[in-house]
């Protein structure tokens, strides 16, 4: 068998809502994956499991089952959404995300995804990890790979 390639493309969109009373942030993050089948036979994408971390704390998980079939030498782009919640001991981020005096409301999240594929009764798991920027201050739609992680520092003005 030839390889099945999984490429994490990036964050497609992030939709944010808040609970002011609970100082809680809800982020629905839609990610894009490219899955390429380099074989001369079809493979089944059985499931995609994903989780999102902020500062080493898991803030969201998702699992998609019976997703699609990828034909021989074909590629499919798959979007999946992870609902995340930043609350409790992380609720200081509520202020960072909502204060108008802060001009940039990006946070760095670690996206982890595992794709399980199957062919001829054989299962294979491929995992990817990527740090991404997500805007927690407004609803955002991203160009692909626009949310890649870099690092610069400045104080709140």
């Amino acid at each position: 068998p030839r390889s099945i390639e999984v490429k994490y493309i990036g964050v497609k969109s992030a939709y944010v809502s808040y609970d002011a009373e609970k100082r809680t942030i809800y982020l629905n993050i839609t990610n894009t994956l490219n899955i390429t089948n380099n074989n001369y036979y079809s493979v089944e994408v059985e499931n995609i499991t994903a989780q999102v971390q902020f500062s080493k704390t898991v803030i969201g998980k998702a699992r998609l089952n019976n997703i699609t079939n990828i034909g021989p030498l074909d590629m499919k782009q798959i979007d999946y959404t992870v609902p995340t919640v930043i609350a409790e001991e992380m609720s200081y981020m509520y202020d960072f995300c909502t204060l108008l005096s802060i001009k940039v409301h990006n946070i760095v999240l670690m996206m982890q995804v595992t794709v399980t594929t199957a062919y001829f009764g054989h299962s294979e798991q491929i995992s990817q990890e990527r740090y991404q920027y997500v805007d927690c201050g407004r609803n955002t739609t991203y160009q692909l790979a626009q949310s890649e992680y870099l690092n610069v520092l400045q104080p709140q003005q």
């Epitope: 002011a20 200081y92 909502t98 204060l99 005096s101 946070i107 920027y133 520092l153 400045q154 709140q156």
Partner: antibody
Framework: EVQLQQSGPELVKPGASVKIPCKAS????????MDWVKQSPGKSLEWIGH????????FYNQKFKGKATLTVDKSSSTAYMELRSLTSEDSAVYYC??????????????????WGQGTSVTVSS | DVQITQSPSYLAASPGETITINCRAS??????LAWYQEKPGKTNKLLIY???TLQSGIPSRFSGSGSGTDFTLTISSLEPEDFAMYYC?????????FGGGTKLEIK
């Protein structure tokens, strides 16, 4: 110049309440959140909680829930902390401190960049 | 809650010397640690934030390092005005917690 002005020492009776003001000047009051910190005699610092002056939203250290109440008066740029049902355990110096968020492309952390001079509270009959 | 163990609690040194103060967190706090200086009759001063970034206006003889669970404040070439109380504070998760403090005195 950023300043956080706190009131003078307070001597209060057990079971009573006290309300400590923290008047902010030199910056836009609603641009930053305010934290409160306790320092008992000969001890380290304990974080009490924090308030966002924009909406009055608060988050408390579980240990101080029911003991401390944080409020703000935007018109006078003043933050307040009320301590109730006072006991000798509440005798301490209480500080207000401005919380600043650091960011560039993204969130990079925060700190208490300006502190009040502290208000000493003594609980005694 | 994240426990912060600060050491030593007391330190005697002479002007011109270099000293280090350590803080250890009970779990990973990434880089989210700040250092403060406390002096009688003065308001507390922020020295270092995000583990290693020097606050504006603080002399470069102060430096911070570390991430995860272990952090260090270094003061090189001590000046007379550096003799004070020092505290570290984690801000990775609520409730914020402080180290027990280090009293730096003149030898």
């Amino acid at each position: 110049e950023v300043q956080l002005q706190q009131s003078g020492p307070e001597l209060v009776k057990p079971g009573a309440s006290v309300k400590i003001p923290c008047k902010a000047s030199g910056y836009t009051f609603t641009d930053y959140t305010m934290d409160w910190v306790k320092q008992s005699p000969g001890k380290s610092l304990e974080w009490i909680g924090h308030i966002n002056p924009n909406d009055g939203g608060t988050f408390y250290n579980q240990k101080f829930k029911g003991k401390a109440t944080l409020t703000v008066d935007k018109s006078s740029s003043t933050a307040y902390m009320e301590l109730r049902s006072l006991t000798s355990e509440d005798s301490a110096v209480y500080y207000c401190a401005r919380w600043v968020y650091y960011y560039g492309i993204s969130y990079e952390g925060g700190a208490m960049d300006y502190w009040g001079q502290g208000t000493s509270v003594t609980v005694s009959s | 809650d994240v426990q912060i163990t600060q050491s030593p609690s007391y330190l005697a040194a002479s002007p011109g010397e270099t000293i280090t103060i350590n803080c250890r967190a009970s779990k990973s706090i990434s880089k989210y640690l700040a250092w403060y200086q406390e002096k009688p009759g003065k308001t507390n001063k922020l020295l270092i934030y995000s583990g290693s970034t020097l606050q504006s206006g603080i002399p470069s003889r102060f430096s911070g390092s570390g991430s995860g669970t272990d952090f260090t404040l270094t003061i090189s070439s001590l000046e007379p005005e550096d003799f004070a109380m020092y505290y570290c504070q984690q801000h990775n998760e609520y409730p914020w917690t402080f180290g027990g403090g280090t009293k730096l005195e003149i030898k």
